[in-house]
């Protein structure tokens, strides 16, 4: 069975996957389209890279700007780094500008919703 | 068959509100978002904002923030536009479109509501 | 805001004559993020052209786009009565989401 295949059977219960189930998936050439990932929980989301969600989304990758105001993909944005959304193409825009240190506060970023960011 | 589904015109007093359905049958509303779309004097045309039916999370163009509220009802798979203090300057015609997620562009439209604001 | 600039506002063709549309942006957008519909009078519009350059389900082979950056354009090659329609660029390249004016193509 190859990656869509797989993919088409486990497509109605991914609502509720865990990271760790998102980040194996991306290593199986799932393809997988912008209404599955839009449903995802967004604390499964936030923890990709930017590789890991080409990999999930493949080709349907583009779709993330037009979703780019939208949760999860939005909070995803916010998380990644601008310079690796840029080797993206699409034009995504409100990552973490570059020079800028990523302080994992979970105190902070459960009251503000993002997370902390030092200055160069 | 595609079908986005509007209510027919409105004729409203200035300062009253009024609340426009779009229902939405043929596809899996899930699987789109609904875009809000104003058309006045048949002349050009301004994104209102748009609703994700999965979340219920709108975006709306910042010269309608505070005017217009976008929310939907999975379970009727209708999304609604509620415009608020109205005056003489929301008369126009409103068309919900539909976006397929991780798409740009609406594939298919309602036909349109218009809404007259006078007194 | 991108502001999309569409040029002529109205125009008369005759049939078979060849028609060509702009549509300039105030700043420069990713080209697969411009659009084209079709709207005639008491009706919606209709989605016409996506990415610039890609036809939409049932558009006649007569119609085509093509730009990049800051200037686009959308070309009848003969015209047909059928046609005579308004045509709107948009763009969803950066938020928020923006239309052209319009061009209003009448039949001579």
């Known amino acids: 069975m190859n990656g869509s295949e797989y993919f088409v059977k486990i497509q109605s219960f991914l609502g509720g996957a865990p990271t760790e189930d998102l980040k194996a998936l991306s290593q199986q050439n799932v393809s997988m389209d912008l209404a599955t990932f839009m449903k995802l929980r967004t604390d499964a989301v936030l923890p990709l890279t930017v590789a890991e969600v080409q990999k999930l989304l493949g080709p349907h990758v583009e779709g993330l700007k037009a979703e780019e105001r939208h949760r999860p993909v939005r909070d995803w944005i916010l998380r990644q780094r601008q310079d690796d959304l840029d080797t993206l193409g699409l034009g995504l825009q409100g990552g973490i500008p570059n020079g800028y240190l990523v302080l994992d506060l979970s105190m902070q970023e459960a009251l503000s919703g993002t997370p902390c960011l030092l200055g160069p | 068959d595609v079908q986005l589904q509007q209510s027919g015109p409105e004729l409203v007093e200035p300062g009253a509100s009024v609340r426009i359905p779009c229902k939405a049958a043929g596809h899996t509303f899930t699987d789109y978002n609904v875009d809000w779309v104003k058309q006045s004097h048949g002349q050009s045309l301004e994104w209102i904002g748009d609703?994700?039916?999965?979340?219920?999370?709108?975006i709306y163009n910042q010269k309608f923030e505070g005017k217009a509220t976008l929310t939907v009802d999975t379970s009727s798979s209708t999304a609604y536009m509620e415009l608020r203090s109205l005056t003489s300057e929301d008369t126009a015609v409103y068309f919900c479109?539909?976006?397929?997620?991780?798409?740009?562009?609406?594939?298919?439209w309602g036909q349109g509501t218009t809404l007259t604001v006078s007194s | 805001q991108v502001v999309l600039t569409q040029s002529p506002a109205i125009m008369s063709a005759s049939p078979g004559e060849k028609v060509t549309l702009t549509c300039g942006a105030s700043?420069?957008?990713?080209?697969?993020?411009l659009y084209w519909y079709q709207q005639k009078p008491g009706s919606s519009p209709k989605l016409w052209i996506y990415?610039?350059?890609n036809l939409a389900s049932g558009v006649p082979a007569r119609f085509s786009g093509s730009g990049s950056g800051t200037s686009y354009s959308l070309t009848i090659s003969s015209m047909e009565a059928e046609d005579a329609a308004s045509y709107f660029c948009?763009?969803?390249?950066?938020?928020?989401?923006?239309f052209g004016g319009g061009t209003k193509v009448e039949i001579k």
């Open positions: 609703v994700n039916p999965n979340t219920d999370g709108a």
């Open positions: 990415s610039t350059s």
């Open positions: 948009h763009q969803w390249s950066s938020y928020p989401y923006t």
């Open positions: 479109a539909r976006r397929r997620l991780g798409q740009g562009g609406f594939d298919s």
């Open positions: 700043s420069s957008l990713i080209s697969k993020y």
